[in-house]
Interface confidence: medium
């Protein structure tokens, strides 16, 4: 059985304050069943950025339709970026359960925020 891969192709992304940032993430397999969540930072201090299953994440939209059957693209777009959004973002695969179990994280994409040109 091929090991699940969580692929974040860009090591870093740079955007101007006020613009939108696209963070790419794909998975190599639909198995095991379970959600993808996005976090900023790693370890216990990480911030939940996007969780399709529950919550309201007004500045984040999925690039592809995550409810579509056989979807393997879990890229997100964050709008209206501010300096406080800078950091490393991780796409994390969970196995469905009660509670869901973290399986694998992508390598991370570092988001840097440039001052908006005046």
């Amino acid at each position: 059985e091929e090991e699940l891969q969580v692929i974040q192709p860009e090591k870093s992304v740079s955007v101007a304050a006020g613009d939108s940032a696209t963070l790419n993430c794909t998975v190599s397999s639909l198995i095991p069943v379970g959600p993808i969540q996005w976090f900023r930072g790693a370890g216990p201090g990480r911030e939940l950025i996007y969780n399709l299953k529950e919550g309201h994440f007004p500045r984040v939209t999925a690039v592809s339709d995550p409810t579509k059957r056989n979807n393997m693209d879990f890229s997100i777009r964050i709008s209206n970026i501010t300096p406080a959004d800078a950091g490393t973002y991780y796409c994390v695969k969970f196995r469905k359960g009660s509670p869901d179990v973290e399986l694998k994280s992508g390598a991370g994409t570092e988001l840097s925020v440039r001052a908006k040109p005046s």
Epitope: P44, G45, E47, L48, H56, N80, T82, A84
Partner: antibody, heavy 119, light 108 residues
């Protein structure tokens, strides 16, 4: 409807401790960062502390750093503020406030809990 | 740290008249500015976020404008129930989250 209800306020002497609680309902508590904001009598709003959605990341105002500890129990939908070594200048109404997203404004506020530090 | 300065400290306006409140940031906060209303003896309530967006259930007589460092909250036709202190809050740079010192709106 979102509801935030603080409890645990009261009168204490300088140097003593108190723990505030904030019971949350009406939203997915574990998905949101939460904050404590205080207001001294007749004064404006002062941000005190923030905790991220998972509970592992915290920030504090310089005025309370090392004395106050914010925590949360996502299984009980409850936010806490442990206040140690209380001073007269900590006298205030303490509000818990829900954050709109991980980097955002405060979209819902509790009714507040009054903490009075007096000898 | 970003400092928010609100003016005037107190504003007296007759019912039906326009009230204009100002909030100035010491450095750019983009559009990341919110306005909160606090009536006497009550908790604050969100009015405006991202400088111009009205929060759920807020009457359309309240409007926000501005970006960068200069922001305005306008109450187009003041009602008696609008008597309150109004605070601006920035969330462009944090921690710490910062509030302005407040503007008290009184009914003439």
């Amino acid at each position: 409807d979102v509801q935030l209800v603080e409890s645990g306020g009261g009168v204490v002497r300088p140097g003593e401790s108190l723990r505030l609680s904030c019971a949350a309902s009406g939203f997915s508590f574990s998905s949101y960062a939460m904050n404590w904001v205080r207001q001294a009598p007749g004064e404006g709003l002062e941000w005190v502390s923030r905790i991220n959605s998972g509970g592992g990341g915290t920030d504090y105002a310089e005025s309370v750093k090392g004395r106050f500890t914010i925590s949360r129990d996502n299984s009980e939908n409850t936010l806490y503020l442990q206040m140690n070594s209380l001073r007269a200048e900590d006298t205030a109404v303490y509000y818990c406030a829900k954050q709109y997203d991980w980097n955002g404004f405060f979209d819902y506020w509790g009714l507040g809990a009054l903490v009075t530090v007096s000898s | 740290e970003t400092v928010l300065t609100q003016s005037p400290a107190t504003l007296s306006v007759s019912p039906g008249e326009r009230a204009t409140l100002s909030c100035r940031a010491s450095q750019t906060v983009g559009s990341k500015l919110a306005w909160h209303q606090q009536k006497p003896g009550q908790a604050p309530r969100l009015l405006i976020y991202d400088a111009t967006n009205r929060a759920t259930g807020i009457p359309d007589r309240f409007s926000g404008s501005g970006s960068g460092t200069d922001f305005t909250l306008t109450i187009s036709s003041l009602q008696t129930e609008d008597s309150a202190v109004y605070y601006c809050q920035q969330y462009y740079y944090w921690p710490p989250y910062r509030f302005g010192g407040g503007t008290k709106v009184e009914i003439k």
